[in-house]
Interface confidence: medium
C-alpha cells in the first residue's frame, strides 16, 4: 500500500531548488528494496522536470517556482518497483495543488468606460458599470476579492462628489444633485479596483460620463424689441428676423425654436423658424391694408419643439410693424355692372354711369376713365365722370359681338398716383330685343328632280327673340302659286314644305316667297329653284336659263 500525504505547494517560491515536498512510501519496502519513480504532467510530460523523485528515498521534490495562474493542479502517478524491476505496487495518482499568492493585480476590462446620465438626474440614478477581473484565486482567498472606489472626479463641480460607486459591483450612481449639461457636459472619473477587499493590489481606469440634455433652458429673445415695415397688399414678405438663444444642445428638439404670435387673430402674420440658426422669420401671411391699419404691434412668444422639462418662463418679444402706403388701382363698384338696354337705344344718349372708387383715401387723386374693350365700337365714355353713351346703333342680332343677348365692354379707370395705377371694370349690356328682323327662308337655293320630284323642307329663321318670331306665316306671291304649293311642316310653323304642282321642264326658276313673323313683320324673298334631269331626291345639277315663276305656264 502507498503512504502519500496531501501535497500542496505555494506558487512563486524562492528556493533553493530542488525543494522537498513530501516523502512517498510503499509499505512493500519492508519486504525488500523499493525504487520509486513518477510519471505524468510536470514529470515526464510537459512541463517536463518540474517535479522529480529520489529513486531510493521517495522524496518528491519541486525543481522551480510554480505559477498557479498557469497550472493550478498537477496530476502525477507514482510507481514502485523491486530491484529486479518488477512492480511491487499499482501506480498511484498524486494531486499536487498550487496554492495562490496575491501576485496578480486586478485588471479593468477597458481602459476607458463610457456612460451617460440625464442632466438633473436625481441621486440614486444608475449611470454605468465598470468591471475589473483578477487572475488570482477567488474561491479560497481574498486575493481576487475586488473593491471599487472613485479616486478623483474632474471637474469637481458643482460638488466634488457628484457620483459614487458600489464598492462590490462597480455600478456608478449619481449621489449629489446639480448635474447640468450646460455647465458641465462631461465628467471624468478615475476609478480604482483593489483586491484583498480593497486593501491589496490595485489598478485604475477612466470612466467618462456624458451629461445628456433635457429641455431645461428656454429660448430667450435677444433683443426683445424689433421694428419692421412692409408694403401693403403683399403676402409672404419678410418683415424682420427675430433672434433667440437657447443654452440646450444645438440642433435638438430642446433647442429648436417654435414661435407663436400671441395677438394675430386675423392670421395676417406668420413666423417660421430658420433651421440653421433658429432665427424666427416674421412674414406677412396675407396682404395688409394701409388704409385699414397703418401699424401693428405684435407680441411673439418662443418655446421649443418639445415641452419644457421644468417650469420655465416663456420669453416674449414685441415687434412693431409699419404698413407702407402703396398707390392702389381704383376699384370699380361693382366690378361687373349689368345694364339692360333696348337694341334700338338712341345714338348719343347716356346708357349708364360706371365709376370707380379710389382706395388710397390718404392720397388726393383724380380718376380718368377710358374704354378698354368695345369690339363693336358702339360706346364712348366721359373721361371725368364715367358716363357711358352710344356712339352707334346697337344690334342684339350682331352675333359676332353679342353673346346670349349680352354685349361685354371693359372700362378702365386710371389714377394720377406715382406710379400710375389702373383698375378694370366689366360692363355687361343686356340688349333687349326689338322686332327689327323679318323671317328668312333657309335654304334659298333648292333642287328638284324632273321625274317623281321629292318635296323640299324650307326652314324659316328669324334673328329676333320671341314674341318677334314664330309662328310664321308663309305665302307664295307674284303668281308662284300657279306651279308650286307650300304647306306648314309643324305646328309652330317654323318650316314649310315646297313642291311643284305638275311636271316641270328641266331648268332654273325663281319663286317669290313672302314670310311674316308673329308681329306681322314681313319680307319677300326670292327662292332659286333648279329642276334637274333626275328622279326622286335631287343632288346638285347643271344650271339652265332662269325662268320667271310668275311667267311660267
Amino acid at each position: 500500500d502507498w503512504v502519500i500525504p496531501p501535497i500542496s505547494c505555494p506558487e512563486n517560491e524562492k528556493g533553493p531548488f530542488p525543494k522537498n515536498l513530501v516523502q512517498i512510501k510503499s509499505n512493500k519496502d519492508k519486504e525488500g528494496k523499493v525504487f520509486y519513480s513518477i510519471t505524468g504532467q510536470g514529470a515526464d510530460t510537459p512541463p517536463v522536470g518540474v517535479f522529480i523523485i529520489e529513486r531510493e528515498t521517495g522524496w518528491l521534490k519541486v525543481t522551480e517556482p510554480l505559477d498557479r495562474e498557469r497550472i493550478a493542479t498537477y496530476t502525477l502517478f507514482s510507481h514502485a518497483v523491486s530491484s529486479n524491476g518488477n512492480a511491487v505496487e499499482d501506480p498511484m495518482e498524486i494531486l499536487i495543488t498550487v496554492t495562490d499568492q496575491n501576485d496578480n493585480k486586478p485588471e479593468f476590462t477597458q481602459e476607458v468606460f463610457k456612460g451617460s446620465v440625464m442632466e438633473g438626474a436625481l441621486p440614486g440614478t444608475s449611470v454605468m458599470e465598470v468591471t475589473a477581473t483578477d487572475a488570482d484565486d477567488d474561491v479560497n482567498t481574498y486575493n481576487a476579492a475586488i473593491a471599487y472606489t472613485i479616486l478623483s472626479q474632474d471637474p469637481e463641480l458643482p460638488d466634488k462628489n457628484m457620483f459614487t460607486i458600489n464598492r462590490n459591483t462597480g455600478v456608478i450612481s449619481v449621489v449629489t444633485t446639480g448635474l447640468d449639461r450646460e455647465s458641465f457636459p462631461t465628467y471624468t472619473l478615475v476609478v480604482q479596483a483593489a483586491d484583498l477587499q480593497g486593501e491589496g493590489l490595485s489598478t485604475t481606469a477612466t470612466a467618462v460620463i456624458t451629461v445628456t440634455d433635457t429641455n431645461d433652458n428656454p429660448p430667450i429673445f435677444n433683443p426683445t424689441t424689433y421694428k419692421g415695415q412692409v408694403p401693403e397688399n403683399e403676402a409672404n414678405v419678410v418683415i424682420t428676423t427675430l433672434k433667440v438663444t437657447d443654452a440646450d444642445a444645438p440642433n435638438t428638439p430642446a433647442w429648436e425654436a417654435v414661435y407663436t404670435i400671441l395677438n394675430d387673430d386675423g392670421g395676417q402674420f406668420v413666423v417660421t423658424t430658420n433651421p440653421v440658426n433658429n432665427d424666427g422669420i416674421l412674414k406677412t401671411a396675407k396682404g395688409l391694408d394701409f388704409e385699414a391699419k397703418q401699424q401693428y404691434i405684435l407680441h411673439v412668444a418662443v418655446t421649443n419643439v418639445v415641452p419644457f422639462e421644468v417650469s420655465l418662463t416663456t420669453s416674449t418679444a414685441t415687434v412693431t410693424v409699419d404698413v407702407l402706403d402703396v398707390n392702389e388701382a381704383p376699384i370699380f363698384v361693382p366690378p361687373e355692372k349689368r345694364v339692360e338696354v333696348s337694341e334700338d337705344f338712341g345714338v348719343g344718349q347716356e346708357i349708364t354711369s360706371y365709376t370707380a372708387q379710389e382706395p388710397d383715401t390718404f392720397m388726393e387723386q383724380k380718376i380718368t376713365y377710358r374704354i378698354w374693350r368695345d369690339t363693336a365700337n358702339w360706346l364712348e365714355i366721359n373721361p371725368d365722370t364715367g358716363a357711358i353713351s352710344t356712339r352707334a346703333e346697337l344690334d342684339r342680332e350682331d352675333f359676332e359681338h353679342v353673346k346670349n343677348s349680352t354685349y361685354t365692354a371693359l372700362i378702365i379707370a386710371t389714377d394720377n398716383g406715382s406710379p400710375v395705377a389702373t383698375g378694370t371694370g366689366t360692363l355687361l349690356l343686356i340688349l333687349s330685343d326689338v322686332n327689327d328682323n323679318a323671317p328668312i327662308p333657309e335654304p334659298r337655293t333648292i333642287f328638284f328632280c324632273e321625274r317623281n320630284p321629292k318635296p323640299q323642307v324650307i326652314n324659316i329663321i328669324d334673328a329676333d327673340l320671341p314674341p318677334n318670331t314664330s309662328p310664321f306665316t308663309a305665302e307664295l306671291t307674284h303668281g308662284a302659286s300657279a306651279n308650286w304649293t307650300i304647306q306648314y311642316n309643324d305646328p309652330t310653323q317654323e318650316s314649310i314644305i315646297l313642291k311643284p304642282k305638275m311636271a316641270l321642264e328641266v331648268g332654273d326658276y325663281k319663286i317669290n316667297l313672302k314670310l311674316m313673323d308673329n308681329q306681322n313683320k314681313d319680307q319677300v324673298t326670292t327662292l332659286e329653284v333648279s329642276v334637274c334631269d333626275c328622279e326622286g331626291a335631287a343632288g346638285v345639277c347643271r344650271k339652265a336659263q332662269p325662268v320667271e315663276a310668275g311667267l311660267q305656264i
Partner: antibody
Framework: EVQLLESGGGLVQPGGSLRLSCAAS????????MSWVRQAPGKGLEWVSA????????YYADSVKGRFTISRDNSKNTLYLQMNSLRAEDTAVYYC??????????WGQGKMVTVSS | QSALTQPASVSGSPGQSITISCTGT?????????VSWYQQHPGKAPKLILS???KRPSGVSNRFSGSKSGNTASLSISGLQAEDEADYYC???????????FGGGTKLTVL
C-alpha cells in the same frame, strides 16, 4: 439661516385630496434635489417622493405612485406634494428635506396629515 | 427593498458609552460610504448628527462618532447625557429607488 417650513396639512376624508407646501430659505433652492419623508404615528421614517433641482425628474415610492404628485416652483423657492385618493394608511407627519451628498439635511418641522372619516 | 436593521432600544446611564448598530446589505451600507444618522426628540423633526459614516455637521457634539465594517454601520455615543434620550435613525444611500433607506429606529433611554 437654512430653513424649511411646511404648510397645508390637516384632516381629510378617505378618497379626498390635500396639498402640502414647503417654503425654503437660506440656500440656493434650485440647486438641490428635494424629498418628502413621512412618519406614521409611533412608526419609523418612510421615504415618499423626490424631485430634481430643475424639476425635470420625479420619483415616487410604490405606496404612493399614481396618487401623489411632487412639484416645485423655483421662482417661489417652494416644494409641493399634491396628495389625491388619500387612504387611512397615509396618515402621518410629512417632512420635506433637502438632499445633498447622500444626506437629507435640513428637515422641515413636519405637518400632520390625518385621513379619517 | 427592506429597511436597514437597528435594535429597537438601547439604554445606558449618564456618563456611560453606548453603540447602536445598523445592518444593511452589500448593495447599500456595504457598497457606499453614505451612511447617515439622525436624532429625533419626541414631537420634533429628525436632526442630522452624522453623515458619510463619521462626519459631524457643525454644532454636533464630538461625543457622537460613527464607523462601518462590511454591511454594518455603528453609532457610538460617549459620556451619555440626559438630553441624548431620543430616537436614532440610520440611513444609507442606495442606487435606484428608494435612493435613501432608513433603519427602523432605536429608542435610547438614559437611565
Amino acid at each position: 439661516e437654512v430653513q424649511l417650513l411646511e404648510s397645508g396639512g390637516g384632516l381629510v376624508q378617505p378618497g379626498g385630496s390635500l396639498r402640502l407646501s414647503c417654503a425654503a430659505s437660506g440656500f440656493t433652492f434650485s440647486s438641490y434635489a428635494m424629498s418628502w419623508v413621512r412618519q406614521a404615528p409611533g412608526k419609523g421614517l418612510e421615504w415618499v417622493s423626490a424631485i430634481s433641482g430643475s424639476g425635470g425628474s420625479t420619483y415616487y415610492a410604490d405606496s404612493v405612485k399614481g396618487r401623489f404628485t411632487i412639484s416645485r416652483d423655483n421662482s417661489k423657492n417652494t416644494l409641493y406634494l399634491q396628495m389625491n385618493s388619500l387612504r387611512a394608511e397615509d396618515t402621518a407627519v410629512y417632512y420635506c428635506a433637502s438632499w445633498g451628498d447622500g444626506t437629507l439635511n435640513p428637515w422641515g418641522q413636519g405637518k400632520m396629515v390625518t385621513v379619517s372619516s | 427593498q427592506s429597511a436597514l436593521t437597528q435594535p429597537a432600544s438601547v439604554s445606558g446611564s449618564p456618563g456611560q458609552s453606548i453603540t447602536i448598530s445598523c445592518t444593511g446589505t452589500s448593495n447599500d451600507v456595504g457598497a457606499y460610504n453614505y451612511v447617515s444618522w439622525y436624532q429625533q426628540h419626541p414631537g420634533k423633526a429628525p436632526k442630522l448628527i452624522l453623515s458619510e459614516v463619521n462626519k459631524r455637521p457643525s454644532g454636533v457634539s464630538n461625543r457622537f462618532s460613527g464607523s462601518k465594517s462590511g454591511n454594518t454601520a455603528s453609532l457610538s455615543i460617549s459620556g451619555l447625557q440626559a438630553e441624548d434620550e431620543a430616537d436614532y435613525y440610520c440611513s444609507s444611500f442606495t442606487s435606484g429607488l428608494p435612493w435613501v433607506l432608513f433603519g427602523g429606529g432605536t429608542k435610547l433611554t438614559v437611565l
